[in-house]
């Protein structure tokens, strides 16, 4: 007996061939001997089976002695043995229909779990193997689960169902809802305008939800909500904003925040959360602000940074075009009695300058000028 595997919702074509290459009488029946379809002269005839409106054939093949049974919009319960009667012969075909669906929505938040459930006909014992877009393989029986979804899990999952040495392939598109970056860091000189951007790693027709930016300033004992906003069909509207600092927010995606001035008291870490409508859980992106200040007071030239810096970052003070006068893995460096000229304060990581501030030191009889 020939075995054919089908996919729920798809169309399957079961073949039946006669030795005579001409249009002759044929009938297709199910295992209960109920007629599905056949031919009578120029007409296609249908029986009282439950497949009635979904069963078909292709008349163009009849003259070649081929009498297919086409079943559209397959259902699991279409799994059966189908019998083709032609030229006093009977051909049997066993059809097994499988379905593979994602547990809930195919749009899942980063860190959530994906469960794929296999629907199969009674008596079958299929095995399933799925390959994620990043090439990870998972195997299982009726259900397959992947916990802690990552951004790289977004895309087409290819799942192969194996039964009776035959296989059928399913493709399921999964969208992992996340920000493009889990964390970002912004380096600014004191007084500069700060731009924070929170691009999403997915696109959807309509995006609705609400969000908030909590800020933990390095100098503050507790965190503070800087801004709350709503998102409706990709349009951003501010609900509440602190007076200090008075953040501005872009009205369109990607989420964009502007801090008018980088000041030492704002240096620290923020956590932007976004709760999406009809989703449990929130999207998170961490953002860090490092602020640099170079000052000269009396005979002391000082360079300081505030905010979350890595211990391997180097802070240096150097006279332009000269070797560094002082270079330390600390958050403040200074030079006593600095020579006149343009001094540079540099924050660097393995030789790469992240932040630079220049200060002009005048001869001792005059006051300093900050460019």
């Amino acid at each position: 007996k020939k075995v054919v595997l089908g996919k729920k919702g798809d169309t399957v074509e079961l073949t039946c061939t006669a030795s005579q290459k001409k249009s002759i009488q044929f009938h297709w029946k199910n295992s209960n001997q109920i007629k599905i379809l056949g031919n009578q002269g120029s007409f296609l005839t249908k029986g009282p089976s439950k497949l009635n409106d979904r069963a078909d054939s292709r008349r163009s093949l009849w003259d070649q002695g081929n009498f297919p049974l086409i079943i559209k919009n397959l259902k699991i319960e279409d799994s059966d043995t189908y019998i083709c009667e032609v030229e006093d012969q009977k051909e049997e075909v066993q059809l097994l229909v499988f379905g593979l669906t994602a547990n809930s929505d195919t749009h899942l938040l980063q860190g959530q779990s994906l469960t794929l459930t296999l629907e199969s006909p009674p008596g079958s014992s299929p095995s399933v193997q799925c390959r994620s877009p990043r090439g990870k393989n998972i195997q299982g029986g009726k259900t397959l689960s992947v916990s802690q979804l990552e951004l790289q899990d977004s895309g087409t999952w290819t799942c192969t169902v194996l039964q009776n040495q035959k296989k059928v392939e399913f493709k399921i598109d999964i969208v992992v809802l996340a920000f493009q970056k889990a964390s970002s860091i912004v380096y600014k000189k004191e007084g500069e305008q700060v731009e924070f951007s929170f691009p999403l790693a997915f696109t959807v027709e309509k995006l609705t939800g609400s969000g908030e930016l909590w800020w933990q300033a390095e100098r503050a004992s507790s965190s503070k909500s800087w801004i709350t906003f709503d998102l409706k069909n990709k349009e951003v509207s501010v609900k509440r904003v602190t007076q200090d600092p008075k953040l501005q927010m872009g009205k369109k995606l990607p989420l964009h925040l502007t801090l008018p001035q980088a000041l030492p008291q704002y240096a620290g870490s923020g956590n932007l959360t976004l709760a999406l409508e009809a989703k449990t859980g929130k999207l998170h992106q961490e953002v860090n602000l490092v602020v640099m200040r170079a000052t000269q007071l009396q005979k002391n030239l000082t360079c300081e940074v505030w905010g979350p810096t890595s211990p391997k970052l180097m802070l240096s003070l150097k006279l332009e075009n000269k070797e560094a006068k002082v270079s330390k893995r600390e958050k403040a460096v200074w030079v006593l009695n600095p020579e006149a000229g343009m001094w540079q304060c540099l924050l660097s990581d393995s030789g790469q300058v992240l932040l630079e501030s220049n200060i002009k030191v005048l001869p001792t009889w005059s006051t300093p000028v900050q460019p």
Partner: nanobody, 116 residues
């Protein structure tokens, strides 16, 4: 009363084109798959093309595939057969019919003659 009325037949030169129409009435046309058949002179009736109720799926006799196009307009209760690159062997009476029996509906036919 169920009626299928074919029109658009006539005399055409080899290589020419014709468009046949079949006006349906007396039944729910949009629910039935339909067909075109022809009866060449002195021969039996042969099936040419099928179209499903929505117009999404079509099927053709090998000798007319690529030359003939079956289509339908459910809003106008009309079935069409566009015939291009006509040959002398396409001569005959053309009939529209329901694809299935039941209901087994037939039209009265329209004559197509391909001759130079």
């Amino acid at each position: 009363e169920v009626q299928l009325v074919e029109s658009g037949g006539g005399l055409v030169q080899p290589g020419g084109s014709l468009r046949l129409s079949c006006a349906a009435s007396g039944f729910t046309f949009s629910k039935l798959a339909m067909s075109w058949h022809r009866e060449p002179p002195g021969k039996g009736r042969e099936w040419l093309a099928d179209i499903d109720s929505s117009g999404d799926t079509t099927d053709y006799l090998a000798s007319v595939k690529g030359r003939f196009t079956i289509s339908r307009d459910n809003a106008k209760n009309t079935l069409y057969l566009q015939m291009d690159s006509l040959k002398s062997e396409d001569t005959g009476v053309y009939y529209c019919a329901s694809r299935e029996d039941p209901p087994g509906y037939w039209g009265q036919g329209t004559q197509v003659t391909v001759s130079s």
